[in-house]
Interface confidence: low
């Protein structure tokens, strides 16, 4: 499923991520936006042999399993392809997950690189939430 | 229970393409890897890559880039692959299988003749 | 790419003899490695994964061990339906590679 920018914001906001640790809603739409481009199937292979899956690019080196990925920690305990569905909530929990587990938000490349410092509340502008 | 069913044996020209396809049943089609081996007498098995049929990511075997191309119609849980400018080094079984790093499921395979 | 050297090539046994399968790589891959059997004519059929672990349905007898670039395939007291090839598979990198094969066949 490939979301609209508003309907993503509505469906992250249902999930709880607004202000999840101190990251206001903007900051998790930006990232999505540049991770995946709202893509819930986006899959990308990192250079180390693990694989990056769904609409926030979780890594399969650390955060879910697919089989694929020697020394997998599957710290959220999910298979990745559970990342790939429509439904988001797999992809929030354990973006809740990663983003308490001390670097915040920085765990994402791209939204270091794209959102970090940007004005991230454009990400949510008009959007009825 | 899941199931992966390749269509049927091909015989080909050289200078030709062909498309095999793999139907898959029993399983949530968009969210594995499609993996493509081929099979060669003296040859052992080779893989040549393999296909996310619900994001179309794909990787390619270096060996076989302009040689194979995947595709997928997650409308019909079906996935694909051309091969292109055959030889006779093509000619060949192809199979087909769910990817987990190893490989539980596989299809019957596609015999491929070049001649 | 990871090379993987299966021995002996051909193996002749009697039923009831145990058997062992070598597999190695060119390089370390963990406990990426995984074992097939194949009849004439038929599809590959997964054994063992992740080195040690057995599929259901597939006979006690078989068994795996190893790590590293080292791995064996034994089978305790063949069966003549045990008689074909036998591949192991890497997936500790891509691309994904196949060793060429050990034959199991009746002396």
């Known amino acids: 499923k490939v979301f609209g920018r508003c309907e993503l914001a509505a469906a992250m906001k249902r999930h709880g991520l607004d202000n999840y640790r101190g990251y206001s809603l903007g900051n998790w739409v930006c990232a999505a936006k540049f991770e995946s481009n709202f893509n819930t199937q986006a899959t990308n292979r990192n250079t180390d042999g693990s694989t990056d899956y769904g609409i926030l690019q979780i890594n399969s080196r650390w955060w879910c399993n697919d089989g694929r990925t020697p020394g997998s920690r599957n710290l959220c305990n999910i298979p990745c392809s559970a990342l790939l569905s429509s439904d988001i909530t797999a992809s929030v929990n354990c973006a809740k997950k990663i983003v308490s587990d001390g670097n915040g938000m920085n765990a994402w490349v791209a939204w270091r690189n794209r959102c970090k410092g940007t004005d991230v509340q454009a990400w949510i502008r008009g959007c009825r939430l | 229970q899941v199931q992966l069913q390749e269509s049927g044996a091909e015989v080909m020209k050289p200078g030709a393409s062909v498309k095999i396809s793999c139907k898959a049943t029993g399983y949530t089609f968009t969210t594995y890897w499609i993996e493509w081996v081929k099979q060669r007498p003296g040859h052992g098995l080779e893989w040549i890559g393999e296909?996310?049929?619900?994001?179309?990511?794909?990787y390619y075997n270096e060996k076989f880039k302009g040689k194979a191309t995947f595709t997928a119609d997650t409308s019909s849980n079906t996935a694909y692959m051309q091969l292109s400018s055959l030889t006779s080094e093509d000619s060949a079984v192809y199979y087909c299988?769910?990817?987990?790093?190893?490989?539980?499921?596989w299809g019957q395979g596609t015999t491929l003749t070049v001649s | 790419d990871i090379e993987l050297t299966q021995s002996p090539a051909t193996l002749s046994v009697t039923p009831g003899d145990s058997v062992s399968l070598s597999c190695r790589a060119s390089q370390s891959i963990s406990n990426n490695l995984h074992w097939y059997q194949q009849k004439p004519h038929e599809s590959p059929r997964l054994l063992i994964k992740y080195t040690s672990q057995s599929m259901s349905g597939i006979p006690s007898r078989f068994s795996g061990s190893g790590s590293g670039t080292d791995f064996t395939l034994s089978i305790n007291s063949v069966e003549t339906e045990d008689f074909g090839m036998y591949f192991c598979?890497?997936?500790?990198?891509?691309?994904?590679?196949f060793g060429g094969g050990t034959k199991l066949e009746i002396k």
């Open positions: 296909i996310l049929p619900g994001s179309g990511s794909t």
């Open positions: 598979q890497q997936s500790n990198s891509w691309p994904r590679t």
């Open positions: 299988a769910r990817g987990d790093g190893h490989y539980y499921y």
